[in-house]
């Protein structure tokens, strides 16, 4: 019969950050089609990226309905050229993924250093808060928003003529520190989930910010 | 539906040890912090500390850091407040609660209370 | 630790009338990134559990009459009911819902006059 070429799907893989979250699966399609269905542990299965010879199906729209369900997905392979027909009885080969909760899992994108002020010997450093693809009434959340205060920052800052690194958290998106006047300094931001015990517990660093250059600001 | 359903009142001596459990349901219990408030007879609300169900973070409010315990079964969907020596003072209403949908929006659902007397 | 300051203590209000509770945080709870204020405020009517009211410190949680309302920003809020009903009868508490330790307010006792 129609299925009996294709080959199960297989290493299927939750790629996920800031909750923009992809379903990643192997092999590559020879002569064959895939169909992805997302469920939670409750709910009924929904097809997504019907017949697609991609190996991979972004699944955003389904998970931000509620980022803190768990979800399941599966891979269905069909034959390349394969038209659903309601006389067919035979289930295509599938795989199941991991499971998947977004809100434990999601990895958090890097963060962006969106200004810094000097006021004498103080600095004011402000972290951008990402949106996110989770919605409230037809409005964007924030990475804020959906994380509250299970999100912090953490703050590195150097003296530009130096090596030693300071560091400095806050559960806000801002900063206050003491620096030495007629020093410029330098400053990396890190996004922080202190609740998580995973490697996903922390984003990668954000870029590089120095004094003297157009982000900052400073007034005696 | 969700719900949250605590252990029944509780009447024990000072130095005995307590365990009250909230058991969660009709929502994904591992992604939602369980809170631990107390209410002492005729008196406000004190907040004691919170788990994260599924990687068992937890926060204390220093003034009960070292009395209580907060712990969580994620497999029985259950949370549980533990003290190892009860004193006088812990005689209080105690309730969990489940933390809102997003962040920092208030606990949003509230258990029906256990009722702890600790007298000699 | 955030100190929450509700004023008055004890209200009493003619049914149909307006009833307003202070509530003073000693630090501010604007968040900067998404200047969302995490002020919650709770009603615990007699023998019950308190029950959310207000979160972010207007935005009404779903099921609450809308003759309840939350205003203010920083550190001064308020909770405002415009029209009194006798079910509203209740101790109102404020909380700080921004930073560890969450800390409430000591409550204020809404009354029929």
């Known amino acids: 019969s129609g299925t009996t070429n294709t080959v199960a799907a297989y290493n299927l893989t939750w790629k996920s950050t800031n909750f923009k979250t992809i379903l990643e699966w192997e092999p590559k399609p020879i002569n064959q089609v895939y169909t992805v269905q997302i469920s939670t542990k409750s709910g009924d299965w929904k097809s997504k990226c019907f017949y697609t010879a991609d190996t991979e199906c972004d699944l955003t729209d389904e998970i931000v309905k509620d980022v803190k369900q768990t979800y399941l997905a599966r891979v269905f392979s069909y034959p390349a050229g394969h038209v659903e027909s309601t006389g067919s009885t035979e289930e295509p080969p599938y795989e199941n993924s991991p499971e998947f909760t977004p809100y434990l899992e999601t990895n958090l994108g890097q963060p962006t250093i969106q200004s810094f002020e000097q006021v004498g010997t103080k600095v004011n450093v402000t972290v951008q808060d990402e949106w996110t693809l989770v919605r409230r009434n037809d409005t964007f959340l924030s990475l804020r928003d959906v994380f509250g205060k299970d999100l912090i920052y953490t703050l590195y800052y150097w003296k530009s003529s130096s090596s030693g690194k300071k560091t400095a958290k806050t559960n806000t998106n801002e900063f206050l520190i003491d620096v030495d006047k007629g020093e410029n300094y330098c400053f990396s931001v890190q996004a922080v989930i202190p609740s998580r015990r995973t490697a996903n517990r922390k984003s990668t660093d954000s870029p590089v910010e120095c004094m003297g250059h157009e982000k900052g600001e400073s007034r005696e | 539906e969700v719900q949250l359903v605590q252990s029944g009142a509780e009447v024990k001596k000072p130095g005995e040890s307590l365990r009250i459990s909230c058991k969660g349901s009709g929502y994904t219990f591992i992604t939602y912090w369980i809170e631990w408030v107390r209410q002492m007879p005729g008196k406000g609300l004190e907040w004691m500390g919170d788990?994260?169900?599924?990687?068992?973070?937890?926060n204390y409010n220093e003034n009960f850091k070292g009395h209580v315990t907060i712990s969580a079964d994620k497999s029985i969907s259950t949370a549980y407040l533990q003290w190892s020596s009860l004193k006088a003072s812990d005689t209080a209403m105690y309730y969990c609660?489940?933390?809102?949908?997003?962040?920092?929006?208030?606990?949003?659902?509230w258990g029906q209370g256990t009722l702890v007397t600790v007298s000699s | 630790d955030i100190v929450m300051t509700q004023s008055p203590d004890s209200l009493a209000v003619s049914l149909g009338e307006r009833a307003t509770i202070n509530c003073k945080s000693s630090?501010?709870?604007?968040?900067?990134?998404?200047?969302?204020?995490?002020l919650t405020w709770y009603q615990q009517k007699p023998g019950q559990p308190p029950k959310l009211l207000i979160y972010?410190?207007?935005t009404r949680e779903s099921g609450v009459p809308d003759r309840f309302s939350g205003s203010g920003s920083g550190t001064d809020f308020t909770l405002t009911i415009s029209s009194l009903q006798a079910e509203d009868v209740a101790v109102y508490y404020c909380q700080n819902d921004y930073t560890y330790p969450l800390t409430f307010g000591q409550g204020t006792k809404l009354e029929i006059k």
């Open positions: 630090q501010s709870l604007l968040s900067s990134g998404n200047q969302k204020n995490y």
């Open positions: 609660a489940r933390s809102g949908y997003y962040g920092n929006s208030g606990f949003a659902y």
């Open positions: 972010w410190a207007s």
């Open positions: 788990i994260l169900p599924g990687s068992g973070s937890t």
